[in-house]
């Protein structure tokens, strides 16, 4: 019980994180004028990763994309990258966690390959997580160590190539929502991972105990097999907990491991 | 075509009050942010107050800040200015203007008439 | 605040001829984020509201002749008429739209000759 809410637990706070990655990836407010001399300002500047955007007292607002790959500076591509890597192996470990929930019944499908799905997916988030934190921390570095003094749009600005009148840029909310986001989504990846331990059996469990009552043909399976009438009409019949893919013929075939009454 | 008119100007007492008011139609009055200017006789135009669109933000001179407070009621088009500890100095003509891009006042009313005197 | 600057005070033009009026700022009104520069022209007739000519420096408002056209950058700013007619006499205004307190120049008195 406790490691289906631990993975169900994981797997919800992951979902949560990486919806709030692909938020903060696609806000414009990474970086926003900083208003420390000017709070009464009619022209607000900020900035995203795919746009800058310009808002102004009268309401309205302008957005200029940055229509140029090969202009825009390494790090704001670099940024890109890890934001949109964090997200495609997030989308990737969502998948594989729904097959791998342990309340959701698909097929035959053995606990130790569950078990398996549940750690690859916390992988996936543990390292979609660490992806969107270094993202928004290297843009973050980027603010404090550029400070971003005269610049004329993203791209320009960094690069050094316009000087214009000072606009200092600060912290957006994209920022925050980013950490929070990589936070939670690295937190459900650890949980997932927890969630695996508890999903894969001991290597020391009992293997199964046949019991052959005379006149009926009814096999008793301690530790978590299913109970059929009769051997020949139930042969691959897949145990539930078990480290390793027998079926109950291949286990039939060690006599020596079963007491016979 | 976009109308603005003003009323509630008139001759007032130094340190007296005055409310106006501008109706404004055949426009989304409730997208525009709204100022209003004035203009002494003879004299250049000033700023007095604006407020956003969404009435959340109001903005003023040194001049006339803490006296004078700028309203709007979205629901019945109407922009108001409540003008209180009045001074001979602020006798003008009161425009409203809404803004447009580039925080352009694109569109103007007559004018209404402040007579600051005792 | 910043301070706006016009000149001449009054300029008179023979009708047909160029009319250029000059605006210059005390702070660089041009915004980094957009590059876009924040002074808006006026006109104002006698008895009459200040009417929009042009924002942004050089955006001609709709409906405002052509041979009305703005330049400039930064702090110097010009509004030239091209081809000055009977009905462009009044006063011109140049204004601070980057930031508050939004502040006018003292406006240029154009006239015919």
């Known amino acids: 019980m406790a490691v289906t809410a631990c993975q169900g637990l994981g797997f919800v706070v992951s979902l949560i994180g990486i919806a709030g990655i692909i938020a903060a990836t696609c806000m414009d407010q990474w970086s926003t004028q900083d208003l420390y001399n000017n709070p009464v300002t009619a022209v607000f500047n900020y900035q995203g990763l795919w746009r800058s955007c310009v808002r102004e007292s009268s309401g309205f607002t302008e957005c200029r994309g940055y229509f140029t790959l090969l202009g825009l500076p390494a790090m704001l591509q670099a940024v890109r990258a890890l934001m949109i890597v964090g997200i495609v192996l997030g989308a990737i470990g969502l998948l594989v966690s729904i097959f791998a929930l342990k309340c959701i019944r698909i097929g035959s499908m053995e606990d130790s390959a569950k078990a398996n799905m549940t750690l690859t997916s916390g992988i996936m988030f543990i390292v979609s997580g660490l992806c969107a934190i270094a993202g928004v921390s290297v843009f973050a570095n980027m603010l404090v160590t550029n400070f971003w003094m005269s610049t004329a749009n993203m791209y320009t600005g960094m690069g050094g190539m316009v000087q214009t009148v000072q606009t200092r840029y600060t912290f957006g909310a994209a920022l925050f929502v980013g950490w929070v986001a990589g936070g939670l989504t690295l937190i459900g990846g650890v949980m997932m991972c927890i969630a695996c331990r508890g999903l894969a059996p001991e290597e020391t469990n009992y293997k199964a105990v046949s019991y052959h009552a005379s006149g009926h043909s009814v096999a008793y399976k301690p530790g978590g097999f299913k109970a059929s009438t009769g051997f020949g009409s139930n042969t691959k019949n897949k145990k539930i907990y078990d480290g390793g893919a027998r079926t109950e013929d291949e286990v039939q075939s060690y006599p020596s491991k079963h007491d016979y009454v | 075509e976009v109308q603005l008119l003003e009323s509630g100007g008139g001759l007032v007492q130094p340190g007296g009050s005055l409310r106006l008011s501008c109706a404004a139609s055949?426009?989304?009055?409730?997208?525009?942010?709204m100022s209003w200017v004035r203009q002494a006789p003879g004299k250049r135009l000033e700023w007095v107050a604006t407020i956003s669109s969404g009435r959340s933000s109001t903005y003023y001179p040194d001049s006339v800040k803490g006296r004078f407070t700028i309203s709007r009621d979205n629901s019945k088009n109407t922009l108001y200015l409540q003008m209180n500890s009045l001074r001979a100095e602020d006798t003008a003509v009161y425009y409203c203007a809404g803004l447009g891009r580039g925080n352009a006042m694109e569109y103007w009313g007559q004018g209404t008439l402040v007579t600051v005197s005792s | 605040d910043i301070v706006m600057t016009q000149s001449p005070d009054s300029l008179a033009v023979s009708l047909g001829e160029r009319a250029t009026i000059n605006c210059k700022s005390s702070q660089s009104l041009l915004n980094s984020g957009n590059q876009k520069n924040y002074l808006t022209w006026y006109q104002q007739k006698p008895g009459q509201p200040p009417k929009l000519l042009i924002y942004w420096a050089s955006t001609r408002e709709s409906g405002v002749p052509d041979r009305f056209s703005g330049s400039g950058s930064g702090t110097d700013f010009t509004l030239t008429i091209s081809s000055l007619q009977a009905e462009d006499v009044a006063v011109y205004y140049c204004q601070n739209a980057y930031s508050y307190p939004f502040t006018f120049g003292g406006g240029t008195k154009l006239e015919i000759k």
């Open positions: 055949e426009f989304t009055f409730s997208n525009y942010a």
